[in-house]
């Protein structure tokens, strides 16, 4: 008799793929543009990335540091009207893209939560949650919660409102903290909260360090669903050198949880290459005409257009990973086991029941390495075969689909491999 199938876990929509943050509408759409109507025209692009949710804004009225002139129920006319927003929601729904609204109150000011009048602000947020849930949004984000006094209790209250409306609604909180204890204390009182933080932001040094950060986090959070990003808002290039971007894309898409990206992460958008552009929200490079300030600063291979035409580009890798992440059971909700593979490397297996399994091996170092995969670290349910098929490499030159002998696995500097192998009883 065939073994019984393992019961599938309940999956919410944000469990099924990546979230894509557009914090600055104007920067995302480029010079002279930047409104909700224009964003609607970019939904096909988001579909092509196979992201499941768009984290938008803030787009509400906010006069810098002025509580009275901050209205979370009103869209800033610079971004459009409520009708434009409704139209965007409808179009996104048709394309199966959920819309999460950022309600960080004082987003133009010094302190995101104002320095005083915490209760007034909290009440405004509560009213806004109810208003926008009725309007049809799929969730909310609030950032910089380290600046919010009694954050845990407010988050719990806001979570109740969100979940009370529907279990299918999501609340994301963002913090600049990278301290695991602070992160855990925020998570403790909020069961379904998705938290983005700077926890992984200093992980770029070595494979061992990254492995220990990831495993510590997963062990500490138990079987909670988590999210993976390097910060609550900023681009990957703020933290990583160009040669590690592919490696991190592979890692973020294959860890257990929801990967969260900022617009431009898919093309390696880098503010430092665009003089004068703000680090937190540089202009999106759709094509070579997107940055007319200094035309010579932009080459085709830095743009969406140029990378779309190149199967070896970062954007093409992002699309492939996003596709795999959204359709393979082992990546959707599979178990995770990290194991030793030698200094400088981070490797792990993702597996679910009798479905195809995945092996990820990441070389964070700047020298080529032979992987000494320590299968003895793994439980019997996640044993390694002698060979696995190469699904993709972050570097060009390998023959995809070819079987690789795991005992003789060699990785190039900064290379990541995604390998697949079947379940064996």
């Amino acid at each position: 008799r065939a073994p019984r199938c393992r019961e599938l876990p309940a999956q919410k929509w944000w469990h099924t793929g990546a979230l894509y943050r557009i914090g600055d509408l104007q920067a995302f759409q480029g010079h002279g543009a930047g409104n909700l109507a224009g964003l609607k025209g970019r939904l096909d692009y988001l579909s092509s990335l196979k992201v499941k949710g768009l984290v938008l804004g803030p787009i509400h009225k906010n006069q810098k540091d002025d509580v009275a002139q901050t209205d979370l129920l009103q869209i800033d006319p610079n971004f459009g009207s409520k009708e434009d927003f409704d139209s965007l929601l409808q179009s996104a729904k048709k394309k199966s893209i959920r819309v999460i609204l950022d309600l960080t109150p004082n987003y133009r000011g010094e302190n995101s939560w104002f320095s005083t009048q915490v209760d007034t602000v909290a009440t405004k947020v509560k009213d806004a949650l109810e208003f926008w849930l009725q309007a049809g949004v799929d969730g909310f984000q609030v950032r910089d919660i380290e600046n919010l006094k009694d954050a845990s209790s407010f988050l719990a209250e806001w979570q109740n409102i969100t979940k009370g409306f529907s279990e299918d609604r999501l609340l994301i909180a963002g913090t600049n903290s990278s301290d695991l204890q602070q992160i855990l204390s925020l998570l403790e009182s909020n069961k379904d909260l998705l938290l983005t933080s700077s926890y992984l932001s200093d992980s770029g040094s070595t494979g061992e360090h990254t492995k220990s950060l990831v495993t510590q986090y997963l062990n500490a959070t138990g079987n909670r669903w988590c999210s993976w990003s390097l910060s609550q808002a900023r681009l990957l290039t703020s933290f990583l050198p160009a040669q590690l971007l592919r490696l991190y894309q592979l890692m973020l898409f294959t860890l257990p949880g929801t990967p969260v990206f900022s617009y431009g992460d898919e093309i390696g958008l880098d503010a430092a290459a665009l003089p004068g552009q703000p680090m937190e929200a540089p202009v999106m490079l759709w094509d070579e005409s997107s940055f007319p300030d200094i035309p010579g600063a932009v080459s085709a291979n830095m743009t969406v257009k140029g990378q779309s035409e190149d199967p070896g580009s970062l954007l093409s890798l992002f699309r492939r990973l996003s596709d795999q992440r959204s359709k393979e059971r082992s990546l959707l909700h599979g178990d995770f086991h990290a194991f030793s593979a030698g200094p400088g490397l981070f490797s792990y297996i993702r597996h679910w029941d009798q479905n195809e399994r995945f092996l990820v091996v990441l070389n964070f170092g700047d020298v080529g390495l032979s992987a000494g995969l320590q299968a003895s670290d793994l439980p019997a349910s996640a044993s390694l075969p002698a060979k696995a098929d190469l699904l993709l490499s972050t570097q060009p030159g390998r023959e995809e689909g070819s079987p690789l002998e795991l005992e003789r696995l060699k990785l190039e500097p900064h290379e990541g491999l995604l390998l697949r192998f079947p379940y064996a009883a």
Epitope: H31, G32, A271, P275, G276, Q277, P278, M279, E280, E288, S289, P292, D293, I294, P295, G296, A297
Partner: antibody, heavy 125, light 113 residues
Framework: QVQLVQSGAEVKKPGASVKVSCKAS????????MHWVRQAPGQGLEWMGI????????SYAQKFQGRVTMTRDTSTSTVYMELSSLRSEDTAVYYC??????????????????WGQGTMVTVSS | DIVMTQSPDSLAVSLGERATINCKSS????????????LAWYQQKPGQPPKLLIY???TRESGVPDRFSGSGSGTDFTLTISSLQAEDVAVYYC?????????FGQGTRLEIK
Amino acid sequence: QVQLVQSGAEVKKPGASVKVSCKASGYTFTSYYMHWVRQAPGQGLEWMGIINPSGGSTSYAQKFQGRVTMTRDTSTSTVYMELSSLRSEDTAVYYCARGYEDILTGSRPIFFDIWGQGTMVTVSS
Amino acid sequence: DIVMTQSPDSLAVSLGERATINCKSSQSVLYSSNNKNYLAWYQQKPGQPPKLLIYWASTRESGVPDRFSGSGSGTDFTLTISSLQAEDVAVYYCQQYYNTPITFGQGTRLEIK
């Protein structure tokens, strides 16, 4: 009226650092990029870098990378340029210059419509 | 880096006569997406900071007398003063802003003959 007022002349020894200030008035400080350009005695103009006063992001000419730091203080509408490890070749007049902004398109091409009066920095042992 | 070369290095012209200064860039500064030339001209008088005269190769800055005009495209540009006045004695610089680092020509000294 729109103006940029720079700090006074400085005399420094080789190896030292100098910090020049540039106070803006007559316009919204955070809405325009600021640049630093220097001119050695009897020589041409040399662009050093840019600062966006809104977020503080900077970009420096390769030649000055690692030696120059541009900062700003929005509360006083002032930008600063600090040059370290000074050598005699750094003797020059240092200008802050406001980058142009195209009001219609919001683009900010890098040419300079307003200049400070200049700060003479002399490096000599 | 884009190298800007001006000619002549110095020029003497009689009052009321036409003065022409040339500027050549080592690569094109014409941007095809907006059909604009990323070139500016400045005037610098002794002891003063430079003053913007022309941008986009041919657009006169407000307040600049109409005897100043700019022309050219791609790599070759010209600043023309149609009728030289005494107050036009200065050093003139061209500047490209097509790419960083921003670069200037070496300057052309204009004097009265």
